[in-house]
């Protein structure tokens, strides 16, 4: 992947929300839950109502990028998943509205969404070699791969 410095002048323009109210489950069938306000973690749930419901917004790059670039928001809130550094927890950032244009350091709000069958991967635009990941007894964070789990199943239409 191109280093972040090459991507920093790329502009991303919001297009539309492409998915509403979906749940993310990792490869161990753990759901992402909101923990202690601004953190996310993964847990095996008896009650899926405890899982976070996300919305996904699509962005178009000024550089003709074949990758699908998305923002992740907790449904019915103004909280957006924000990347930090490797092995650091992702945080929930409150913003008054979905950003119309994202560039520079704000790209920590964006992820490249890739699908391989039922597996979904979210690579940080700010750190293109790092994925949203779950880790045993830790927060949802950015990681390069094992032992963290980087593939997710998207569960839609959970009543």
């Amino acid at each position: 992947s191109a280093p972040f410095s090459f991507l920093s002048n790329v502009k991303y323009n919001f297009m539309r929300i492409i998915k509403y109210e979906f749940i993310l489950n990792d490869a161990l069938n753990q759901s992402i839950i909101r923990a202690n306000d601004q953190y996310l973690t993964a847990a095996a749930l008896h009650n899926l109502d405890e899982a976070v419901k996300f919305d996904m917004g699509a962005y178009k790059s000024s550089k003709d990028d074949a990758k699908i670039t998305v923002i992740l928001r907790i449904s019915k809130t103004q909280l957006y998943v924000t990347a930090q550094d490797e092995d650091q927890p992702v945080l929930l950032k409150e913003m008054p509205e979905i950003p119309k244009t994202i560039t520079g350091s704000e790209t920590n709000l964006l992820f490249f969404w890739e699908t391989h069958g039922t597996k979904n991967y979210f690579t940080s635009v700010a750190h293109p070699n790092l994925f949203i990941a779950t880790k045993q007894d830790y927060w949802v964070c950015l990681a390069g791969g094992p032992p963290s789990i980087t593939d997710f199943q998207i569960l839609e239409n959970q009543a």
């Epitope: 202690n36 976070v52 419901k53 449904s75 019915k76 909280l79």
Partner: antibody, heavy 122, light 107 residues
């Protein structure tokens, strides 16, 4: 089994301080915020605020800023609520309650301690 | 801050009656409304979250509905063990305010 066990009843004189403890068990303490709720005799429930059990950062409702302090001992999964400069109107039952987000957005209090009665009397 | 106005403050009903309590928020709370039951001398217990979702183990005679600013809690057929005070609470944003409570008594 998830449990919140609070310290016993306290009788204090005006001007004194009191520290109520709330020991959690049966879940990962750092994953759920701890709320404090006051109930004066014959009255309703008042949300006092909560403490982030991972960062230790507290949020207080306006009526509970100043004399109230929330703290943690993460090694024993215990939350504390300290109240200084006690007044007669602080006489109440104080509850701790675990906070949970349903769907990641709706905040509720799903497990409660048994309550600690604090009586302030000269 | 979001204010929660609950009514009535008390009500008396007979066993088998349908009982309704209302809760009004000072602004739209997007269905983020929870209901608690507190029996005399006991700790509060979460019954319903997110307007209408029954917590595990809660009898199906309890239900909730509503949207925007107006919400309703219903007991379809009042039982003697339902004698308690019921509180609504908004879960949209802190401070997570409660309604004043509704004390339910048996006629």
């Amino acid at each position: 089994e998830i449990q919140l066990v609070q310290s016993g009843a306290e009788v204090k004189k005006p001007g004194a301080s009191v520290k109520v403890s709330c020991k959690a068990s049966g879940y990962t303490f750092a994953h759920y915020g701890m709320n404090w709720v006051r109930q004066a005799p014959g009255q309703g429930l008042e949300w006092m605020g909560w403490i982030n059990t991972y960062t230790g950062q507290s949020t207080y409702a306006d009526d509970f800023k100043g004399r109230f302090t929330f703290t943690l001992d993460t090694s024993t999964s215990t939350a504390y609520m300290e109240l200084s400069s006690l007044r007669s109107e602080d006489t109440a039952v104080y509850y701790c309650a675990r906070g949970i987000y349903y769907f990641g957005s709706n905040y509720a209090m799903d497990y409660w301690g048994q309550g600690t009665t604090v009586t302030v009397s000269s | 801050d979001i204010q929660m106005t609950q009514s009535p403050s008390s009500l008396s009903a007979s066993v088998g009656d349908r009982v309704t309590i209302t809760c009004r928020a000072s602004q739209d709370i997007s269905n983020m409304l929870n209901w608690y039951q507190q029996k005399p001398g006991k700790t509060p217990k979460l019954l319903i979250y997110y307007t209408s979702r029954l917590r595990s183990g809660v009898p199906s005679r309890f239900s909730g509905s509503g949207s925007g600013t107006d919400y309703t809690f219903t007991i379809s057929s009042l039982q003697p063990e339902d004698i308690a005070t019921y509180f609504c609470q908004q879960g949209k944003k802190p401070p997570y305010t409660f309604g004043q409570g509704t004390k339910l008594e048996i006629k």
